[in-house]
């Protein structure tokens, strides 16, 4: 069964959490249909984003932190390891030193921390997708 | 009610055609939620746009063609009649020379015809909103 | 071996001007953000100014904001600050200094390599 | 204004003891410490960085830690060569830089 979208859910990561993500492309290619990953400081969504992770399907992929309101410097990968029209699954590790993205089990970006994992409070996943998963793992202390 | 989204709708269009549209942001407007018309020259979502029209609430609209799989010249306007998470109303008038968009009953945007507005067999609508309402009024000959 | 080596620091009147250079060698010059640090005598670090690695970005301390600019040239392996309508409390050792990793100016990460730095006296 | 990262002024540790440095008003629970020493008439050289972390060459007995508002740089049996001052740096933003006023390491 699908989750609303966008989907939002308090969480709180720290080195050893993943965040796993299944869905779809609402759209083809061509159309360019984007899916948003927002790590957040508070569980309002205008709040400041630890990692932002935007795919434009088909095209790119942009990685930034928005401080204090303000966007900072923009990563940027033509990778495109998601298939046109086919179910994908996404998982954000936290590394001690950076997160690591892998989709449909292979690592496809890294972006490094610039502000404490542990600053999280939210994720929010939109954007044109289905979601039909998402869950937040803790490594066992 | 909610109609879904992506909004799909067969439409035939002539100069006297209004296509209206009520909906709303699904995220505050620091978050670029967008918002995307598209005129399409078949059912299929792949098939050409005579009319593209694409909202980055706070920040742009671009408005475009796609002819044979193309993207042609984008034209950009700043202006930005949209209001932070409040519900809007969009009408797109065929003119005999151009489209007419009007937001709130404003006049916001025109975008001449590059193709015949009568190629034009279905209307999508999608991206980050909510929408409730969609109609395609015809003048009455 | 690294090497950052700082030039141009002199001593020039107020209201005057003065480019420091730092010319860099032992590591690929174009993959790392920089940023220059200055000591006033005796006094602690403060951090002036900072450039991503490809030149588009730039940051500075509210101090010297619209007086100094930072700017690079990747293809002469080189970090440049001009420093514009200085004053007396300009007078420090500035240092070159290069972040720990890549591309970005990450206070997380630090700055891992420093130059000994060069001397601007501002004085009439 | 920039942030304001405070330490004190002069720490005092006998040889072969425990050093302990703070450094005090910045938003550790968001952004990560490191912390440089420097030697009379030298650069400043990195000796911890993400709060913890220790760069390669650095001596074990150095270590650091944070919380709250809190960062801390900690020599475990400190040595004669450890006499130096020390500044902590963290971040107004990712990467707006800001350091603490130095501690001077005394008594060895």
């Known amino acids: 069964s699908l989750l609303p979208v966008p989907y939002t859910e308090a969480a709180s990561l720290s080195t050893g959490s993943t965040v796993t993500i299944k869905g779809r492309p609402l759209a083809c290619f061509l159309n360019e249909p984007y899916l948003q990953v927002d790590f957040h400081t508070e569980m309002k969504e205008e709040s400041d984003i630890v990692f932002h992770f935007q795919v434009c399907f088909g095209r790119r992929v942009v990685m930034n932190s928005r401080e204090y309101g303000a966007w900072k410097q923009q990563v940027e990968s033509k990778n495109m390891p998601f298939q046109d029209g086919q179910e994908f699954e996404l998982s954000i590790s936290v590394l001690p030193d950076k997160y690591q993205v892998m989709v449909n089990g292979q690592s496809s970006y890294t972006f490094d921390h610039r502000i404490k994992p542990e600053a999280v409070k939210m994720v929010q996943v939109w954007r044109d997708i289905s979601l039909t998963k998402f869950n937040v793992s803790y490594l066992k202390r | 009610s909610l109609l879904p989204v992506p909004y799909t709708e067969a439409a035939s269009l002539s100069t006297g055609s209004t296509v209206t549209i009520k909906g709303r942001p699904l995220a505050c407007f620091l978050n670029e939620p967008y918002l995307q018309v598209d005129f399409h020259t078949e059912m299929k979502e792949e098939s050409d746009i005579v009319f593209h029209f694409q909202v980055c609430f706070g920040r742009r609209v671009v408005m475009n063609s796609r002819e044979y799989g193309a993207w042609k010249q984008q034209v950009e306007s700043k202006n930005m009649p949209f209001q932070d998470g409040q519900e809007f109303e969009l009408s797109i008038s065929v003119l005999p020379d151009k489209y007419q968009v009007m937001v709130n009953g404003q006049s916001s945007y025109t975008f001449d015809h590059r193709i015949k507005p009568e190629a034009v067999k279905m209307v999508q609508v999608w991206r980050d909103i909510s929408l409730t309402k969609f109609n395609v009024s015809y003048l009455k000959r | 071996e690294l090497q950052l080596v700082e030039s141009g620091g002199g001593l020039v009147q107020p209201g005057g001007s003065l480019r420091l250079s730092c010319a860099a060698s032992?590591?690929?010059?174009?993959?790392?953000?920089m940023s220059w640090v200055r000591q006033a005598p005796g006094k602690g670090l403060e951090w002036v100014s900072n450039i991503n690695s490809g030149g588009g970005s730039t940051g500075y301390a509210d101090s010297v904001k619209g007086r100094f600019t930072i700017s690079r040239d990747n293809a002469k392996n080189t970090l440049y600050l001009q420093m514009n309508s200085l004053k007396p409390e300009d007078m420090a050792v500035y240092y070159c200094?290069?972040?720990?990793?890549?591309?970005?100016?990450?206070?997380?990460?630090?700055?891992?390599?420093w130059g000994k730095g060069t001397l601007v006296t501002v004085s009439s | 204004s920039q942030a304001v990262l405070t330490q004190p002024s002069a720490v005092s540790v006998s040889l072969g003891q425990t050093a302990r440095i703070t450094c005090q008003g910045g938003n550790f629970g968001r952004y990560y410490a490191s912390w440089y020493q420097q030697k009379p008439g030298q650069a400043p050289v990195l000796v911890i960085y993400r709060d913890s972390e220790r760069p390669s060459g650095i001596p074990e007995r150095f270590s650091g830690s944070s919380s709250g508002d809190t960062a801390t740089l900690t020599i475990s049996g400190a040595q004669a060569e450890d006499e130096a001052d020390y500044y902590c740096?963290?971040?107004?933003?990712?990467?707006?830089?800001?350091f603490g006023g130095g501690t001077h390491l005394t008594g060895l």
């Open positions: 032992g590591f690929t010059f174009s993959s790392y953000a």
């Open positions: 740096q963290s971040g107004r933003s990712s990467d707006n830089a800001v």
């Open positions: 200094a290069k972040y720990l990793r890549t591309y970005y100016p990450n206070a997380a990460f630090g700055m891992d390599y």
